[in-house]
């Protein structure tokens, strides 16, 4: 069955935007004015996932690119990466678990928990121009809260 998707940008709770840093990495930094056009546009899709009261399973692709955020083990550590996929087969309702994030939405703030690695979240550093990563702590130094903005086409 087809599912809904939308186009959006994400900013962390310190208003840092997400931009590409090389072909397979995102970084977070403050942007202003025309530089805002650099920020990544996500295609967020509803996908099949495990049931939980306030968690909604989504996949986060990069709009018009064959890249999806995914969570894998690297050197025994849960790691966030951009993974290239076959555009003929994606997006789909039943995404592999590494592509699935449990979106938690409270008071217009969003968190994205890895379905593959519970309690690991898409995170940014307090510092400028650092990679977006998968973090295993919430409420610490690293930022796990985001706001979403629809993109007008």
């Amino acid at each position: 069955a087809p599912v809904r998707s939308l186009n959006c940008t994400l900013r962390d709770s310190q208003q840092k935007s997400l931009v590409m840093s090389g072909p397979y990495e995102l970084k977070a930094l403050h942007l202003q004015g025309q530089d805002m056009e650099q920020q990544v546009v996500f295609s967020m899709s509803f996908v099949q996932g495990e049931e939980s009261n306030d968690k909604i399973p989504v996949a986060l692709g990069l709009k018009e690119k064959n890249l999806y955020l995914s969570c894998v083990l690297k050197d025994d550590k849960p790691t966030l990466q951009l993974e290239s996929v076959d555009p003929k087969n994606y997006p789909k309702k039943k995404m592999e678990k590494r592509f699935v994030f449990n979106k938690i939405e409270i008071n217009n703030k969003l968190e994205f928990e890895s379905a593959q690695f519970p309690n690991w979240y898409i995170s940014t550093s307090q510092a400028e121009n650092m990679p977006v990563f998968l973090g295993g702590t919430k409420g610490g130094q690293d930022i796990t809260d985001f706001t979403m903005q629809f993109v007008s086409s």
């Epitope: 069955a1 186009n7 939405e105 629809f150």
Partner: antibody, heavy 119, light 108 residues
Framework: EVQLVESGGGLVQPGGSLRLSCTAS????????MAWVRQAPGKGLEWVGI???????YYASWAKGRFTISRDTSKNTVYLQMNSLRAEDTAVYYC?????????????WGQGTLVTVSS | EIVMTQSPSTLSASVGDRVTITCQAS??????LSWYQQKPGKAPKLLIY???TLASGVPSRFSGSGSGTEFTLTISSLQPDDFATYYC??????????FGQGTKLTVL
């Protein structure tokens, strides 16, 4: 105060068109998914469609082609453009905010605006 | 498209009664099921989402259960304010959203 206010309803002849507006206050539509739901007199609720960003709109099968949902974020308003109206489109039309993106349920509703299609 | 079927269409009961309304989906919707209450001339009010989670401010006498295709809404002890029409609705991010035809709860 967080609320939705619909306007634009009224009497229209069969085959005519009408544009309904839903203006939000107390929150920004730049990140809120908005749906339209209608209710014919004495009947049940019927989903019309939903809008996320301007390119991501979804409709009930019966509404495709005749009804169009759009948004103007600068006016914090969502619209429902209804064309080729028929007597069976007579209903109270509600706009509603999706509780969370892709939750598919609706936690904030407007008061509704009545559309009557009759000659 | 998914079809939601509620039963009964009308239900008469008295204050203090325990009442149950059922909702059947034409295909599995997991736990993506919501319940609404509507009073005449008013907009619907979300009662329950994700089949069993009470919406904010909803009294605990309301409860929901079920998954897959079979769902129930229970009011444990009917209060005068509860006489209204109740609707189920498939939720989640599927493209199609549908409401049940409604159950009108009236005073016996």
């Amino acid at each position: 105060e967080v609320q939705l206010v619909e306007s634009g309803g009224g009497l229209v002849q069969p085959g005519g068109s009408l544009r309904l507006s839903c203006t939000a206050s107390g929150f920004s539509l730049s990140s809120a998914a908005m749906a339209w739901v209608r209710q014919a007199p004495g009947k049940g609720l019927e989903w019309v469609g939903i809008i996320y960003d301007s390119a991501s709109t979804y409709y009930a099968s019966w509404a495709k082609g005749r009804f169009t949902i759009s948004r103007d974020t600068s006016k914090n308003t969502v619209y429902l453009q209804m064309n080729s109206l028929r007597a069976e489109d007579t209903a109270v039309y509600y706009c509603a905010r999706e509780r969370a993106i892709f939750s598919g349920d609706f936690v904030l509703w407007g008061q509704g605006t009545l559309v009557t299609v009759s000659s | 498209e998914i079809v939601m079927t509620q039963s009964p269409s009308t239900l008469s009961a008295s204050v203090g009664d325990r009442v149950t309304i059922t909702c059947q989906a034409s295909q599995s919707i997991s736990s993506w099921l919501s319940w609404y209450q509507q009073k005449p001339g008013k907009a619907p009010k979300l009662l329950i989402y994700k089949a069993s989670t009470l919406a904010s401010g909803v009294p605990s006498r309301f409860s929901g259960s079920g998954s897959g295709t079979e769902f129930t809404l229970t009011i444990s002890s009917l209060q005068p304010d509860d006489f209204a029409t109740y609707y189920c609705q498939n939720a989640g991010g599927g493209v199609s959203i549908a409401f049940g035809q409604g159950t009108k709860l009236t005073v016996l």
